[in-house]
């Protein structure tokens, strides 16, 4: 997977008046890395590994960049004409990537009230606008303002592209991101399924990087794909990832099944617990919104199985 740096800024308006603050998060390689602390007006690292990336250097540069970006985005929101009464948001997501072959990609996306209305490839400067008439109107509004603003010239977009990549390279130079491995915690649980069957679930959590093999084996042989159900590999909010795999087996055959895990060159096998085990089973539903705002994980029900 490519290395990536992702800036996510949001500004708000109320009854047509742009609010003074802004929300900002920065993700490094898909992990929460920086957050703008509105109380202290400073960029703050998210967790120990983020602090380790810069070592003893200060976060002044990041604070300055985020503050400047927030100010630009507030000005952009002020120029959006169709602001009706009530609360509205303008969100900018900027991403740059360095791929294994050293090629780079950079893009910028604008969302109004959670709806994508304008994208730009920062390398080719090519703009993309969704088909809807609302998006077309918003995009015209914003593009006109950006053209008027002397700061938003051709060189500005090249600079945004270059700055993002420069920061990404600076973070990667520390070696913390490249070297970082956190082994998963693996947990196997069982729950009642239909008569004579049980569902066995293998969960891997708190691991980094995100690449992992998690599969059920029967007698040491991997079960076919269609007999297993996999969860997505998702961030768990601590700078690490989580995932799961489940399958249905016949009661009494538990000893034949093991969960096999492989991560960052290490592997392990985990048997199915025998007997009656008390299992807290959470059913998580993943709502995927394409507006770039936070994904929602909704705990639908929690059941005790005995």
């Amino acid at each position: 997977e490519p290395h990536s740096l992702r800036y996510n800024l949001t500004v708000l308006s109320w009854d047509g008046s742009v609010q003074s603050g802004f929300l900002a998060e920065v993700h490094l390689d898909g992990q929460p890395f920086l957050r703008y602390d509105r109380q202290k007006c400073r960029a703050k690292p998210q967790g120990q590994w983020a602090e380790d990336v810069l070592g003893n250097k200060t976060w002044d540069r990041e604070t300055r960049d985020l503050t400047g970006n927030g100010k630009d985005l507030r000005m952009t929101l002020a120029h959006i004409k169709d602001q009706k009464e009530g609360l509205h948001s303008l969100q900018e997501i900027r991403v740059c990537e360095i791929h294994e072959d050293n090629s780079t990609r950079s893009s910028q996306h604008f969302y109004y009230d959670g709806e994508l209305f304008l994208s730009q490839n920062l390398e080719t400067e090519e703009w993309t606008v969704p088909q809807s008439s609302r998006a077309q109107t918003l995009a015209m509004n914003v593009r006109n303002f950006l053209k008027e603003d002397a700061m938003k010239t051709k060189t500005h977009y090249h600079a945004m592209h270059a700055d993002c990549l420069q920061e990404l390279r600076r973070y990667l130079e520390s070696g913390v991101v490249l070297r970082r491995t956190v082994p998963p915690m693996v947990n196997v649980t069982r729950s009642e399924a239909s008569e004579g069957n049980i569902t066995v679930t293998c969960r891997a959590s708190s691991f980094y990087p995100r690449n992992i093999i998690l599969t059920w084996r029967q007698d040491g042989v991997s079960l076919s794909h269609d007999t297993q159900q996999w969860g997505d590999v998702l961030p768990d909010g601590n700078g690490t990832y989580q995932t799961w795999v489940a399958t249905r087996i016949c009661r009494g055959e538990e000893q034949r099944f093991t969960c096999y895990m492989e991560h960052s060159g290490n592997h392990s096998t985990h048997p199915v617990p025998s007997g009656k085990v008390l299992v807290l089973q959470s059913h998580w539903q993943h709502h995927h919104h394409h507006h770039g705002l936070n994904d929602i994980f909704e705990a639908q029900k929690i059941e005790w199985h005995e």
Epitope: V221, S222, Y260, H267, T269, P271
Partner: antibody, heavy 118, light 108 residues
Framework: QVQLKQSGPELVKPGASVKVSCKAS????????IYWVKQSHGKSLEWIGY????????VQNQKFKGKATLTVDKSSSTAYMHLNSLTSEDSAVYYC???????????WGQGTLVTVSS | DIVLTQSPTTMAASPGEKITITCSAS???????LHWYQQKPGFSPKLLIY???NLASGVPARFSGSGSGTSYSLTIGTMEAEDVATYYC?????????FGSGTKLEIK
Amino acid sequence: QVQLKQSGPELVKPGASVKVSCKASGYAFTKYNIYWVKQSHGKSLEWIGYIDPYNGGTVQNQKFKGKATLTVDKSSSTAYMHLNSLTSEDSAVYYCATTDGYSLFTYWGQGTLVTVSS
Amino acid sequence: DIVLTQSPTTMAASPGEKITITCSASSSISSNYLHWYQQKPGFSPKLLIYRTSNLASGVPARFSGSGSGTSYSLTIGTMEAEDVATYYCQQGSSIPFTFGSGTKLEIK
């Protein structure tokens, strides 16, 4: 490449016991199960049991419970099968085998001939 | 235990001839759990076909497998001298794993 090298032939007296070894190389030993199979002279194959080298967990053919004990030594990447209270019925070639994760007995050792005779 | 019955027990074929060996299970098994092995005289068994129809690494394309439920077969498209061996089917569906009694293939 994956190789399973078994210990040499054994001639043992009835009532005695024997330990057959199977040294694995060419792959991460704890990644895949080791299976044991018996082949009596001129006969078919019989599965004895298997062991997961990572955690030592075993699954055995009921017929060989009490007869065969499966163990591993992770430090030397070696699996062992201990056969006790030997009788002439136990005279056979014993094979160890391992998997590639997709089929049961993908790779086989060369076999160990155990002869029980007074 | 699942009993696997192979037929024929022995057979002789001429080079170039098409060979079919059958394996009948005493109870139904999923095709994912049926494998075939070849054992040449004085050697260890060798995996030939796994999961009913998948050729193991290095196995010539003249070998093929098919079947479902209780009835499975191994086919050699054109018999060659080096195919002289005993062939075993094996099930991994239920414990204990069992092997067929073997089919000894000779050359005419």
